[in-house]
């Protein structure tokens, strides 16, 4: 029961996490610049991984996509790649984990197969979460670096002077969504891996022992078979006593009239 709960909870947490990673990847507010000192109008500039937007105090808002790949910073490309890899791995992990859920019966799937699938999805969730956390952290680092570099970056161009505007580069909402979502996916993955341990069937050694009585009594099997836990003296399936008791491996091929097993 605890295993099913752990697996189910891991799945739900990962599902929320991956939904968050997708949301963060699509969001426009990865970084924001509040151009409060603009002489014309208050301008609020914000960027995502795919487009940049501007909002003015008048309410005017315009977004433009980055239609080129070549002119973009390598860091931004790396963040895009990390987030997409995270989403793809997470989606595959979700697909695998649906079939691995203990509460869902698919044909005659064995517990060992479900355990393997649970472990696979768990690892996928962990990697997915790490990709998202890495992606968001790389972007945050880029913003911090940009802030320090923009404090005194001025140069003269062909058409006069070009300088970097003094702005407050702040972390956008998408960064926090990404960090939380990545963390949830990671936690969900760990929970799936823990659930896998409970799902995996222990290697049992249920070898029936038939007792051949010397008289006309019926042969029987004792009910309490020993699993290979290492406890008890008969872990190697040795003969218990020589008075006709044999393990299944040692039973003669010809049938006996008292052999009902």
């Amino acid at each position: 029961m605890a295993v099913t709960a752990c697996q189910g909870l891991g799945f739900v947490v990962s599902l929320i996490g991956i939904a968050g990673i997708i949301a963060a990847t699509c969001m426009d507010q990865w970084s924001t610049q509040d151009l409060y000192n603009n002489p014309v109008t208050a301008v609020f500039n914000y960027q995502g991984l795919w487009r940049s937007c501007v909002r003015e105090s008048s309410g005017f808002t315009e977004c433009r996509g980055y239609f080129t790949l070549l002119g973009l910073p390598a860091m931004l490309q790396a963040v895009r790649a990390l987030m997409i890899v995270g989403i793809v791995l997470g989606a595959i992990g979700l697909l695998v984990s649906i079939f691995a859920l203990k509460c869902i019966r698919i044909g005659s799937m064995e517990d060992s197969a479900k355990a393997n699938m649970t472990l696979t999805s768990g690892i996928m969730f962990i990697v997915s979460g790490l990709c998202a956390i890495a992606g968001v952290s790389v972007f945050a680092n880029m913003l911090v670096t940009n802030f320090w570099m923009s404090t005194a970056n001025m140069y003269t161009g062909m058409g006069g002077m070009v300088q970097t505007v003094q702005t407050r580069y702040t972390f956008g909402a998408a960064l926090f969504v990404g960090w939380v979502a990545g963390g949830l996916t990671l936690i969900g993955g760990v929970m799936m891996c823990i659930a896998c341990r409970g799902l995996a069937p222990e290697e049992t050694n249920y070898k029936a022992v038939s007792y051949h009585a010397s008289g006309h009594s019926v042969a029987y099997k004792p009910g309490g078979f020993k699993a290979s836990t290492g406890f008890g003296s008969n872990t190697k399936n040795k003969k218990i006593y020589d008075g006709g008791a044999r393990t299944e491996d040692e039973v003669q091929s010809y049938p006996s009239k008292h052999d009902y097993v």
Partner: nanobody, 121 residues
Framework: EVQVQESGGGLVQPGGSLRLSCAAS????????MGWYRQAPGKQRELVAG???????TYAHSVKERFTISRDNAKNTMYLQMNSLKSEDTAGYYC???????????????WGQGTLVTVSA
């Protein structure tokens, strides 16, 4: 790299009119605000008029009712229509553009080299 180039300056009589143009060129992603600044000899540079991408305008108190700023977002061009010019309007007029640059992931401010407007009889 983004560049801005002013044009339209010259000598004009008091009460006359001039139309200044500022064209932005280069690797432009999006220019948000554009403005005209002027600097008379021995004085500080001051904002004459500015216009946002959304069309919000601002004017210096001394030029209100006389100057009109406009822009064409598609052409990345800004205009300043100057009417009823006075001798105190004599100055170097500079174009300013604030643009977002995805290449550096930074906000850039670009200044032109200026165009001279002389109001004299």
């Amino acid at each position: 790299e983004v560049q801005v180039q002013e044009s339209g300056g010259g000598l004009v009589q008091p009460g006359g009119s001039l139309r200044l143009s500022c064209a932005a060129s280069g690797n432009i992603f999006r220019i948000d605000t554009m403005g005209w600044y002027r600097q008379a000899p021995g004085k500080q540079r001051e904002l004459v008029a500015g216009i946002s991408r959304g069309g919000t305008t601002t004017y210096a108190h001394s030029v209100k009712e006389r100057f009109t700023i406009s822009r064409d977002n598609a052409k990345n061009t800004m205009y300043l229509q100057m009417n009823s010019l006075k001798s105190e309007d004599t100055a170097g007029y500079y174009c300013n553009a604030q643009a977002w640059d995805p290449g550096t992931f930074r906000y850039l401010e670009v200044w032109g080299q200026g165009t001279l407007v002389t109001v004299s009889a």
